[in-house]
Amino acid sequence: DTEIKVNPPQDFEIVDPGYLGYLYLQWQPPLSLDHFKECTVEYELKYRNIGSETWKTIITKNLHYKDGFDLNKGIEAKIHTLLPWQCTNGSEVQSSWAETTYWISPQGIPETKVQDMDCVYYNWQYLLCSWKPGIGVLLDTNYNLFYWYEGLDHALQCVDYIKADGQNIGCRFPYLEASDYKDFYICVNGSSENKPIRSSYFTFQLQNIVKPLPPVYLTFTRESSCEIKLKWSIPLGPIPARCFDYEIEIREDDTTLVTATVENETYTLKTTNETRQLCFVVRSKVNIYCSDDGIWSEWSDKQCWEGEDLSKKTLLR
């Protein structure tokens, strides 16, 4: 009984199409597959950023795979051929591993790369990123930001830079069509006559860095002798009502402070007839149904009632 063997895939490589971290892993079928013409060969692919403890594992019949990586670090990948048990009259047969690596040769010392990169997607409409220049870089150093997400033909440079002392320290992005719920890749590189500048790579999803506008049109309504309903409207803009959480701060007679988090645009407050003053503010955040993370809005303008019997009227700002 001869032992069945299969070769690893050929020409295994990691290809960088210039998408700032979204890479192609590709390979060719193994040599000497003639014996297995009736068989569908599969490939087990493992890959990770160098330094990561865990491998991502994919089993595929294709000759390519695409995924996002952190280009601040190197990438390693390995692949082997799998012959299913149907092809071998018994157990699955695996080839040896073919391995490859990829990294961008770093230019410049780490301190020259941008510091404190911060990106906020204001009201799910306007993306603004800002950074500080690298430590010890001279004023002739300038930074350029490039971005890419699936749907763009190629990486694009920032349209509107924010400057300080002639240096680019931020970017206001143009309209980003169909850019949420997918990885958004950024590279900030730099140039200087004096020394090479280290590039920085960032990846995030836009819906997770949204800072909404604050709620508007805060009102009070007396529901009963001991209940007041606080109401407000969703912030203006494209974010649907179902995507909001709210935090309320209520102050009664300058003493009691009540805070609460709610999912819709009302909150019922128990009060006594002795309440002489009532103030509240609200802020908004994108909730877990629409994102994995988010940033609280600024607080709304304060809405106050004082001096009249709350039971007599609906109070509008």
Epitope: Q125, Y126, L156, I162, F173
Partner: antibody, heavy 119, light 111 residues
Framework: QVQLVQSGAEVKKPGASVKVSCKAS????????MNWVRQAPGQRLEWMGR????????DYNQNFKDRVTITRDTSASTAYMELSSLRSEDTAVYYC????????????WGQGTLVTVSS | DIVMTQSPDSLAVSLGERATINCRAS??????????MNWYQQKPGQPPKLLIY???RQGSGVPDRFSGSGSGTDFTLTISSLQAEDVAVYYC?????????FGGGTKLEIK
């Protein structure tokens, strides 16, 4: 609730200067560019310049030949436009107008300030 | 400076009919894969209102009957079904290069 509230109408003599203010509210002042646009009677709109309140960076329309100065006071969320060496053809309504970036146009405008230059 | 030329200067259209306004730039206003072309509506005694940015994107709160198209040097604003409240002057504007420049305006009236 975005609002841009401009200072009131002005009547000036030729050769004088005028300074128009624009108080912004309802948004984060430093996140948006502030443009100044004027409209003379029966004329097309004319862009005068813009300031980035975030960093104070300014672009001017060189057609105004150094007569225009745009400034901002971020603590007061207010932008200013000063036009010097006034002449009769500077009689116009002057608007401040907010825009996020060059690809977004100008989405909110002040109510306008009429400046009349007359001897 | 980039010169913006609008046509026609004035236009009379029946209620419910389509209105089309054209704008030509003296050079391309495309860059970074974006057309830096905006359209505004101005009613008497009021500041302009943003209708369309980046050639085809609707401004906030703009009715769906307003649409923009074009690239490079030639652009069009279309009102699919004219309403009485659409009577105004319409301006195109390029924001590719400083100084930003406006077209001369098109006065839209009801026939």
């Amino acid at each position: 609730q975005v609002q841009l509230v401009q200072s009131g109408a002005e009547v000036k003599k030729p050769g004088a200067s005028v300074k128009v203010s624009c108080k912004a509210s309802g948004y984060t002042f430093s996140n948006y560019l502030m443009n100044w646009v004027r409209q003379a009677p029966g004329q097309r709109l004319e862009w005068m310049g813009r300031i980035d309140p975030y960093d104070g960076d300014i672009d001017y329309n060189q057609n105004f030949k150094d007569r225009v100065t745009i400034t901002r006071d971020t603590s007061a969320s207010t932008a200013y436009m000063e036009l010097s060496s006034l002449r009769s053809e500077d009689t116009a309504v002057y608007y401040c107008a907010r825009g996020y970036g060059t690809a977004y146009g100008v989405d909110y405008w002040g109510q306008g300030t009429l400046v009349t230059v007359s001897s | 400076d980039i010169v913006m030329t609008q046509s026609p200067d004035s236009l009379a259209v029946s209620l419910g009919e389509r209105a089309t306004i054209n704008c030509r730039a003296s050079e391309s206003v495309d860059n970074y894969g974006i057309s830096f072309m905006n359209w505004y509506q101005q009613k008497p005694g009021q500041p302009p209102k943003l209708l369309i940015y980046a050639a085809s994107r609707q401004g906030s709160g703009v009715p769906d009957r307003f649409s923009g198209s074009g690239s490079g040097t030639d652009f069009t604003l279309t009102i699919s079904s004219l309403q009485a409240e659409d009577v105004a002057v319409y301006y195109c504007q390029q924001s590719k290069e400083v100084p930003w420049t406006f077209g001369g305006g098109t006065k839209l009236e009801i026939k």
